[in-house]
């Protein structure tokens, strides 16, 4: 039979006077060692049949006395079987055994849940010698019990290579419920059901759960732990907690905020990091993500020119790194740029629009209709052309660069001329007679030099030749023109 002790039970010492008992109360034993702390034990308990021999593990000594009487079997006396107490209270329990004096060096060890308790435990062994036997009491005390002290404690003693084991003493530390699972913060879709879990344990059991949403109890009657709350959906942020109740009282979980996923806020602080003739590098600060991670962003670009057709170019990019290079833009143009980002719920509004300009670029096309002819009387080559279309100048023309290459008898010489932007003709001096002159022209802006025109060749005869005719840029698909005069 297991004896159970509860707090505030009536004291009922096992033995009168200072003889070994299951609990030290007001009696002072012989040879007792001082306690590590002077607490008052919280527990008293009633033993069953004090002094009855242990029925389990006993050692039968082979030694006999002078009168050849065999010694009785050795066993720990029965003590309390189950001690129930509250957390932080003190407890003291013991094992007692009477050992014939013929045995020397008897030691008692304490074990908890199959492991020997060594080191800094308050274990005290007291000896009460008599003529034939010595009563040994091994006491174990815990000044402030914790849940980790829960378990089954036993005493062991070795005699004659035999091990004597006491009955277990079960220590049950009771306290407020202890959460093993608490609700977690979540981000949820509007009007969509979701679950929260709460689990708490004693002892004492049972543990009952009450759910609280925004300070109102969801269930007015207790639910057994563990409890899963199915929230039928939310339209706005809510705070949830759970209360765990047992006979010792109540523990409240942390409150968790459940947020409703929404479309993100628009990005802010869109700024121009770098501009070139045909691209603009922008960055932005993302807005609030609406409790759902950003998936991607969209950059919207429209020409700011009031005469433009108002079409919007859209560039999609990943949400990170909040940076995008807009390409394929016109040079020296004004643009309005806005950024919008999306999460699983949808797209944000567009950020405030910002104005940005591309820089001047080198022209993207060469001058057109290049014509070259020889003015023999002045010993010059006259060159004429048409300037490239305004749209493709990619800036303000500052002039033209003329490349003229003179080739004669294996000798080649290239010369470059810069001419102003006014007009569309130039005159260069003949450098070599009896040679081919190859002319190419490029438009120039502050952004750089554009592509050169297709080459136009003219043959410069030796002095004295009379006939001449102009040479011009070929029609597409023709071979390089060579005009021999």
């Amino acid at each position: 039979a297991i004896t159970e002790a509860r707090e505030e039970a009536k004291p009922y010492p096992l033995f009168p006077g200072p003889f070994p008992g299951s609990l030290q109360t007001d009696h002072t034993p012989l040879l007792s060692l001082p306690h590590a702390s002077g607490y008052q034990p919280a527990l008293m308990f009633s033993p069953t049949q004090p002094g009855r021999p242990h029925t389990g593990n006993v050692a039968i000594p082979q030694v006999t006395s002078v009168e050849s009487k065999p010694l009785p079997p050795l066993a720990f006396k029965h003590t309390v079987g189950h001690i129930i107490l509250s957390e932080h209270k003190g407890v003291k329990f013991n094992c007692s055994i009477s050992v014939p004096n013929i045995y020397q060096d008897t030691t008692i060890s304490w074990w908890k849940d199959g492991k020997e308790l060594l080191g800094a435990h308050h274990a005290i062994t007291q000896f009460y010698p008599d003529d034939e036997v010595t009563a040994i009491i091994a006491s174990f005390s815990i000044t402030s019990v914790q849940r980790s002290d829960n378990g089954s404690y036993i005493c062991k003693m070795k005699i004659n290579n035999e091990e004597i084991v006491s009955d277990p003493i079960y220590i049950e530390v009771q306290g407020l419920p202890h959460f093993t699972k608490q609700p977690e913060s979540m981000n949820v879709t509007r009007n969509t059901a979701f679950n929260l879990t709460c689990q708490a344990v004693g002892p004492p059991e049972p543990v009952n759960i009450f759910w609280v949403q925004n300070s109102s109890r969801v269930n007015e009657q207790p639910e057994k732990s563990p409890s899963v709350l199915t929230v039928p959906g939310l339209t706005e942020m809510a705070v949830f907690s759970c209360e765990a109740h047992n006979d010792k009282g109540l523990t409240v979980s942390k409150g968790v905020q459940i947020n409703i996923k929404a479309i993100p806020s628009p990005p802010t602080e869109v700024s121009i990091r770098n501009s070139t003739a045909h691209s603009i590098l922008i960055s932005w600060v993302p807005g609030f993500d609406g409790y759902s991670p950003f998936r991607n962003c969209s950059i919207q670009v429209k020409e700011a020119d009031p005469l433009s057709n108002g079409s919007v170019m859209i560039f999609n990019t990943s949400a990170l790194p909040h940076l995008y290079q807009i390409k394929q833009l016109q040079a020296l143009a004004n643009y309005s740029i806005g950024v919008s980002c999306m999460n699983e719920i949808g797209w944000s509004a567009v950020s405030p629009w910002i104005l940005a300009s591309t820089t001047e670029g080198a022209p993207s096309v060469a001058p057109l209709n290049v014509t070259v002819f020889l003015n023999e009387s002045s010993d010059n080559v006259d060159i004429r052309w048409m300037k490239p279309p305004t749209k493709q100048q990619d800036g303000e023309l500052v002039g033209y660069r003329i490349s003229h290459v003179w080739q004669s008898a294996g000798i080649s010489k290239e010369l470059l001329e810069e001419v102003g932007q006014n007009g569309s003709r130039a005159r260069i001096s003949v450098q070599v007679h009896n040679a081919t002159c190859t002319v190419r022209i490029a438009a120039v802006t502050r952004g750089g030099v554009g592509p050169f025109s297709d080459p136009v060749k003219i043959f410069i005869p030796a002095h004295g030749w009379v006939d001449y005719a102009p040479s011009s840029t070929p029609a597409p698909g023709n071979a390089d023109p060579v005009l021999i005069i």
Partner: antibody
Framework: QIQLVQSGPELKQPGETVKISCKAS????????VNWVKQAPGKGLKWMGW????????TYAGDFKGRFAFSLESSASTAFLQINNLKNEDMATYFC???????????WGAGTSVTVSS | QIVLSQSPAILSASPGERVTMTCRAN?????MHWYQQKPGSSPKPWIY???NLASGVPARFSASGSGTSYSLTVSRVEAEDAATYYC?????????FGSGTKLEIK
């Protein structure tokens, strides 16, 4: 199947006492609170209060404190509504209802008609 | 305590018509439940927690709302829908009922 069975109609005189029963079946009685709802002839629903079937603790709405008493006989899975010192304005149909989470009344009794007449 | 106002008090509709009744609270609530009651019968659970149809409720019924304004809609009214509909809030104790909207079929 889950149901709440209420006692039959009552005809009482002013000043008398009436006790209405509500017997639950098909579920664990102590898991859900039993609520009482009053409906006067031609009127809407009025929540009177409830009894915690786990602890036995009754809760009364403001207008129903004093002459009204909720009680239980858990072994019979039955809740009771007693009205003392009956008045003419107590003439109504009284419903018991099982309450689940979020104070939703998912099962209702058929109602007990109480007539107060001198 | 929270007061629930249902409007209109009486709603008259022809079969096949779409009708909407509203329930307004004088303070924000988390959920609204709805019950259907026919003369001589006990109320039936109809809508749970704002928008969830109770078992057996026809799909032509829907409900929505948040804060202080909630509504119940019947997309195509049928003769069997004639009843009084009560709303009941969950948000602040005591969890009161509205005064009811009576749906009549012409």
């Amino acid at each position: 199947q889950i149901q709440l069975v209420q006692s039959g109609p009552e005809l009482k005189q002013p000043g008398e006492t009436v006790k209405i029963s509500c017997k639950a079946s098909g579920y664990t009685f102590t898991d859900y609170g039993v609520n009482w709802v009053k409906q006067a002839p031609g009127k809407g629903l009025k929540w009177m209060g409830w009894i915690n079937t786990y602890s036995g603790e009754p809760t009364y709405a403001g207008d129903f404190k004093g002459r009204f008493a909720f009680s239980l006989e858990s072994s019979a899975s039955t809740a009771f509504l007693q009205i003392n010192n009956l008045k003419n304005e107590d003439m109504a149909t009284y419903f018991c209802a099982r309450r689940v989470r979020y104070w939703y009344f998912d099962v209702w009794g058929a109602g007990t008609s109480v007539t107060v007449s001198s | 305590q929270i007061v629930l106002s249902q409007s209109p008090a009486i709603l008259s509709a022809s079969p096949g018509e779409r009708v909407t009744m509203t329930c307004r609270a004088n303070s924000s609530v988390s959920y609204m439940h709805w019950y259907q009651q026919k003369p001589g019968s006990s109320p039936k659970p109809w809508i749970y927690a704002t928008s969830n149809l109770a078992s057996g409720v026809p799909a032509r019924f829907s409900a929505s709302g948040s804060g202080t304004s909630y509504s119940l809609t019947v997309s195509r009214v049928e003769a069997e829908d004639a009843a009084t509909y009560y709303c009941q809030q969950w948000g602040s104790n005591p969890f009161t009922f509205g005064s009811g909207t009576k749906l009549e079929i012409k």
